[in-house]
C-alpha cells in the first residue's frame, strides 16, 4: 500500500532573469527512493538516479542545475518557463509518487511589487 505523500513548494513566482529552486519532499513512507524525475509538462528536464547520479537534458543544460538535494534549480528564467513542473519519485516497494509545482515567471517590475502566489 502506498502511504507516502509528496510535499511541494506549491504555486510559486519568480522574476524574469532570476532563478528558482523547485523542491519536493516525500514523507510518511519508509520506501526507498530509487529515482527522481523532473518534468515540465511533457518534457523531461533531469533525472537523479540513486545509482547513476544526475543527468540533465542537454537541451536544458545551460539553464538547469541539479540540487539542492533532490531538487532542481532553474536559472535565467524567461516568461516561457511559466507553467507546471512535476517531480516524479520512483520508489521501492511503493511505486511512483508525483508532485506538482506551478511556476509563474513575472516581469521584474511586477515581481518587485509583491504579486506572489501563496503556498497552500
Amino acid at each position: 500500500m502506498m502511504t507516502g505523500t509528496i510535499e511541494t513548494t506549491g504555486n510559486i513566482s519568480a522574476e524574469k532573469g532570476g532563478s528558482i529552486i523547485l523542491q519536493c519532499h516525500l514523507s510518511s513512507t519508509t520506501a526507498q527512493v530509487t529515482q527522481v524525475n523532473w518534468e515540465q509538462q511533457d518534457q523531461l528536464l533531469a533525472i537523479c538516479n540513486a545509482d547513476l547520479g544526475w543527468h540533465i537534458s542537454p537541451s536544458f543544460k545551460d539553464r538547469v542545475a541539479p540540487g539542492p538535494g533532490l531538487g532542481l534549480t532553474l536559472q535565467s528564467l524567461t516568461v516561457n518557463d511559466t507553467g507546471e513542473y512535476f517531480c516524479i519519485y520512483h520508489t521501492y516497494p511503493d511505486g511512483t509518487y508525483t508532485g506538482r509545482i506551478f511556476l509563474e515567471v513575472l516581469e521584474s517590475s511586477v515581481a518587485e511589487h509583491g504579486a506572489r502566489f501563496q503556498i497552500p
Partner: antibody, heavy 117, light 107 residues
Framework: EVQLQESGPGLVKPSETLSLTCAVS?????????WHWIRQPPGKGLEWIGF???????VYNPSLKGRVTISHDTSKNQFSLKLSSVTAADTAVYYC??????????WGQGTTVTVSS | DIQMTQSPSSLSASVGDRVTITCRTS??????LAWYQQKPGKVPKLLIY???TLAEGVPSRFSGSGSGTDFTLTISSLQPEDVATYYC?????????FGQGTKLEIK
C-alpha cells in the same frame, strides 16, 4: 551529424592494460550527454563498461570496478578507456557511445581488441 | 544487478508477419527500457527508449509496450531488412544491462 570513432591497439598481452580512445566529431563532449564504453565478446551479447559525464565524473560497472578507468580530454574532444590486468575474457569488440538518460543514441563503429600472448 | 531475460533466443518468420519479442526484468524498472537492432557485422542501433518512444528515423512498423518487469518489441509487418539480433536494455540503475539477444531470421 555526431560521429564517434574508436582507436587503439588491436592486440594486448594478458596482464597488460588495454587503452582505447573515442574521438567525437559534430558535438562537444563538454556540452552535455554522458559518454559510454560498451563491449561485445565474439558471438556474444553486449556488456556495459561505464561512462564519463561532461563534468568529468565517472560511473563504472561494479563487475569491472578496480580495473577500469574512463577519462576525457575536452581540448581534443575525446574520451578514453583503460582496462588493466586483461585476460582472454576481455577479448571483444569495444564500442564508444553517447548516452542520453542512460540509453545509447549514437554509437561508434567499434574496434576489435584481442587479448593474447 | 537487474537481470534481463529475452525470449525467444531466436525465431524465424515470413515477410509480412507480425513478430513479437519479449524482455523480462528481475525487478521493476518502471518504463526505463530500450531496444536495439544489430544487423550482422554492424553496430547496434537504437530503436526504442522509455519502453515505447521510437528513436529518430525508425520505421513505424516497430513499436514497444510494457511496464514494470514485462516488455514487448513488436514488428507489425516483417521486412527483409529487419534480419538482425535485437537487444533490450534497462536504463534505470547500475549496472546498465542488456538482454542476451534475439536473433531474427526470414523463413
Amino acid at each position: 551529424e555526431v560521429q564517434l570513432q574508436e582507436s587503439g591497439p588491436g592486440l594486448v598481452k594478458p596482464s597488460e592494460t588495454l587503452s582505447l580512445t573515442c574521438a567525437v566529431s559534430g558535438y562537444s563532449i563538454s556540452s552535455g550527454y554522458d559518454w559510454h564504453w560498451i563491449r561485445q565478446p565474439p558471438g556474444k551479447g553486449l556488456e556495459w563498461i561505464g561512462f564519463i559525464r561532461d563534468s568529468g565524473s565517472t560511473v563504472y560497472n561494479p563487475s569491472l570496478k578496480g580495473r577500469v578507468t574512463i577519462s576525457h580530454d575536452t581540448s581534443k574532444n575525446q574520451f578514453s578507456l583503460k582496462l588493466s590486468s586483461v585476460t582472454a575474457a576481455d577479448t571483444a569488440v569495444y564500442y564508444c557511445a553517447r548516452g542520453l538518460f542512460w540509453y545509447f543514441d549514437v554509437w561508434g563503429q567499434g574496434t576489435t581488441v584481442t587479448v593474447s600472448s | 544487478d537487474i537481470q534481463m531475460t529475452q525470449s525467444p533466443s531466436s525465431l524465424s518468420a515470413s515477410v509480412g508477419d507480425r513478430v513479437t519479442i519479449t524482455c523480462r526484468t528481475s525487478e521493476n524498472i518502471f518504463s526505463y527500457l530500450a531496444w536495439y537492432q544489430q544487423k550482422p557485422g554492424k553496430v547496434p542501433k537504437l530503436l526504442i527508449y522509455n519502453t515505447k518512444t521510437l528513436a529518430e528515423g525508425v520505421p513505424s512498423r516497430f513499436s514497444g509496450s510494457g511496464s514494470g518487469t514485462d516488455f514487448t518489441l513488436t514488428i507489425s509487418s516483417l521486412q527483409p531488412e529487419d534480419v538482425a539480433t535485437y537487444y533490450c536494455q534497462h536504463h534505470y540503475g547500475n549496472p546498465l544491462t542488456f538482454g542476451q539477444g534475439t536473433k531474427l531470421e526470414i523463413k
